[in-house]
């Protein structure tokens, strides 16, 4: 998952309390026993922000040695720093671990920017704000990287919540959640509430600022808002979905879906914007330029490289327009939407100007590897990840940042057809496709 | 070629309002590829941005001057103009108008530049 | 704020030499810089943006380098036309208000 532009996290957030809540509805879905409720111990469990990834605490080994585990939905290795790097607070410590088994095998995993490598083996890992189990999973000591982890971060490692057939060096070795689900009662799914600032932090702020929700095995109410919609993962890989059509402001951009998918369309909590496919990303640029035509902002600003500051508190999003993904229902013919606000697409930056300004990047950025639909759509929703029943649901977040006027939504259903279509087939190869 | 040119009054009294305006020649100030923006410079001194101003009539401006600076633009004048109100002698300085191209982020075209006074 | 600082505040150099001058800035600003000339009782005339791209019409004497936070305006051979104040200016955080302090290039 293209860690040039995937992760990368510099501060922690503001979760649940942050900008305005919407209330919550009453219309619940039937329960579903041992699926659905109060997980009151893993809410809130998550600190970080999308411009460097959430993480949750993990322990790994006996004693138990706590570190800090960027939640990474794009990828499917556990693998944490086992060694000193000027950026680690801490690291792993194999030898102070009795219950550490060698595995005898090396894993190298390169990215577009940047790689790590290390040394496999197993070890007992839990969660203290997850579910009261410990496993053995596998564990990738990673004793050499390179643009990997990130200064001021508070991360360790990685959790990659994908599947076996992404994981390095290859789908033989089981990923973290597998082991999970195999060796306990916790059902096979998980759910994420990832809660964007909607403004700057600063550091003090960060640190004592919390991030969302990792509901592992379960759903619950209090994270969303409205009914959960689903689409299909299409194949169990990455958590790969198909998107049918796109709209700026209610405008359709009018493109064959598969250029939507071209090569692939996922759900990636690791990577901080929202990736198009450079056709897409060009339309869907000049739409929003289009939209938002009465003010002019620089080249650069488009490529999200530079920061447009307004006055704080003056940013005016009204200027900018919704975006609005609709995705492949599990009913024939049928399609749901999910439409994020500039709130979410315009991401806030701390520390560059001054008190009296709110500065901004644009977080919508071009890919040549599918569409990304990365932390600035999932910060808009609950989203859940029901591996049992091979399905995606997406629901308006408890805690998305919005304004008086607009808010983020999941609405349907819609008549779409031939959305099988939508789908682009990857040529096989003989070689990995995934040099990411 | 395009060419910009500040006028106003070089002598202003205290807690008066300022005044100038640039007029853009051998170009269309309602082009979209560029904001129009002024830029002080007081004597011996460097530069500070004071504001911009896009042919929509969208306006930014300089935060410590925030309060007291008006940019307007007039189209069919091919102009735009500068109000600094309530100006003291640390308001003396020579006013330039600019072009702001290059993806709207640098300055690539300047006028002369205009010293105005503030005096009584 | 990102501030810019520029050094040396005064180069004195002969006509021939190579004046380097440079901008730091106190937090990265990518390659979004820009250098500015202004000769005494003129205006500023851009030189370099882009930290590295040369304006239309400058010679090429006049080179910029750097990205993030330290930026270099090189003048390979200075010509008596190019004694005269050089100032930086970001534009990583837009609009674009920020001005380094300046470098006067005299003759020795």
């Known amino acids: 998952t293209q860690h040039g532009i995937r992760l990368p996290l510099r501060s922690g957030l503001g979760g649940a309390p942050l900008g305005l809540r919407l209330p919550r509805e009453t219309d619940e879905e039937p329960e579903e026993p041992g699926r659905r409720g109060s997980f009151v111990e893993m809410v809130d469990n998550l600190r970080g922000k999308s411009g460097q990834g959430y993480y949750v605490e993990m322990t790994v080994g006996s004693p138990p040695q706590t570190l800090n585990i960027l939640v990474d939905t794009g990828s499917s290795n556990f693998a944490v720093g086992a060694a000193p790097h000027p950026f680690l607070h801490r690291y792993y410590q194999r030898q102070l671990s009795s219950t550490y088994r060698d595995l005898r095998k090396g894993v190298y995993v390169p990215y577009t920017q940047g790689k790590w490598e290390g040394e496999l083996g197993t070890d007992l890992v839990s969660i203290p704000h997850g579910p009261n189990v410990t496993v053995r999973a596998n564990i990738a000591a990673i004793t050499e990287s390179d643009k990997f982890f990130i200064n001021g971060s508070n991360w360790e490692g990685i959790l990659g919540l994908a599947y076996a057939e992404i994981a390095r060096p290859d789908d033989s070795l089981e990923p973290f959640f597998d082991s999970l689900v195999k060796q306990t009662h916790v059902p096979n799914l998980f759910s994420l509430q990832l809660c964007g600032a909607g403004f700057p932090l600063n550091q003090s702020e960060v640190l004592a600022s919390v991030g969302g929700s990792m509901i592992i095995g379960g759903i619950d109410h209090s994270l969303y808002t409205g009914s959960l919609w689903y689409t299909p993962i299409r194949r169990e890989w990455y958590y790969e979905v198909i998107i049918v059509r796109v709209e700026i402001n209610g405008q359709d951009l009018k493109m064959d879906c598969k250029e939507y998918n071209y090569d692939k369309s996922i759900v990636d909590s690791g990577t901080t914007n929202l990736r198009l496919p450079k056709k897409v990303f060009e339309a869907a640029v000049k739409s929003i330029k289009a939209a938002s035509s009465t003010e002019k902002f620089p080249d650069g600003f488009w490529l999200g490289e530079q920061l447009v500051c307004w006055q704080a508190g003056t940013t005016p999003w009204n200027i900018f327009p919704v975006i609005s993904l609709y995705l492949m229902g599990e009913v024939t013919n049928q399609s749901f939407r999910i439409t994020i606000l500039p709130q979410q697409y315009l991401r806030p930056v701390e520390d560059v100007a001054t008190s009296q300004d709110d500065c901004y990047k644009f977080a919508i950025s071009q890919s040549s590897t599918g569409t990304v639909m990365g932390a600035v759509i999932m910060e808009g929703f609950y989203v859940v990840f029901d591996r049992a029943r091979k399905r995606i649901g997406f629901a308006v977040s408890a805690c998305h940042v919005h304004d008086e006027f607009r808010t983020a939504a999941v609405e349907g259903p819609f008549v779409t057809l031939d959305m099988e279509d939508c789908g682009y087939n990857i040529p096989q190869t003989d070689e990995s496709t995934l040099m990411t | 070629q395009l060419q910009l040119q500040e006028s106003g009054p070089g002598l202003v009294k205290p807690s008066e309002t300022l005044s100038l305006t640039c007029t853009v020649s051998?170009?269309?100030?309602?082009?979209?590829?560029?904001?129009w923006g002024w830029i002080r410079q007081p004597p011996g001194k460097g530069l500070e941005w004071i504001g911009m101003?896009?042919?929509?009539?969208?306006?930014w401006y300089n935060p410590s001057l925030r309060s007291r600076v008006t940019i307007s633009v007039d189209t069919s004048k091919n102009q735009f103009s500068l109000k600094l109100s309530s100006v003291t002698a640390a308001d003396t300085a020579v006013y330039y108008c600019?072009?702001?191209?290059?993806?709207?982020?640098?300055?690539?075209?300047w006028g002369r530049g205009t010293l105005v006074t503030v005096s009584s | 704020e990102i501030v810019l600082t520029q050094s040396p505040a005064t180069l004195s150099l002969s006509p021939g030499e190579r004046a380097t001058l440079s901008c730091r800035a106190s937090?990265?600003?990518?390659?979004?810089l820009a250098w500015y000339q202004q000769k005494p009782g003129q205006a500023p005339r851009l030189l370099i943006y882009d930290a590295s791209k040369r304006a239309t019409g400058i010679p090429a004497r006049f080179s910029g380098s750097g990205s993030g936070t330290d930026f270099t305006l090189t003048i390979s051979s200075l010509e008596p036309e190019d004694f005269a104040v050089y100032y930086c200016q970001q534009v990583y955080t837009w609009p674009p208000r920020t001005f380094g302090g300046g470098t006067k290039v005299e003759i020795k």
């Open positions: 101003i896009y042919y929509s009539g969208s306006t």
């Open positions: 051998g170009g269309s100030i309602s082009s979209s590829s560029y904001y």
């Open positions: 600019a072009r702001v191209g290059h993806g709207v982020s640098y300055f690539d075209l």
């Open positions: 937090q990265s600003v990518s390659s979004y």
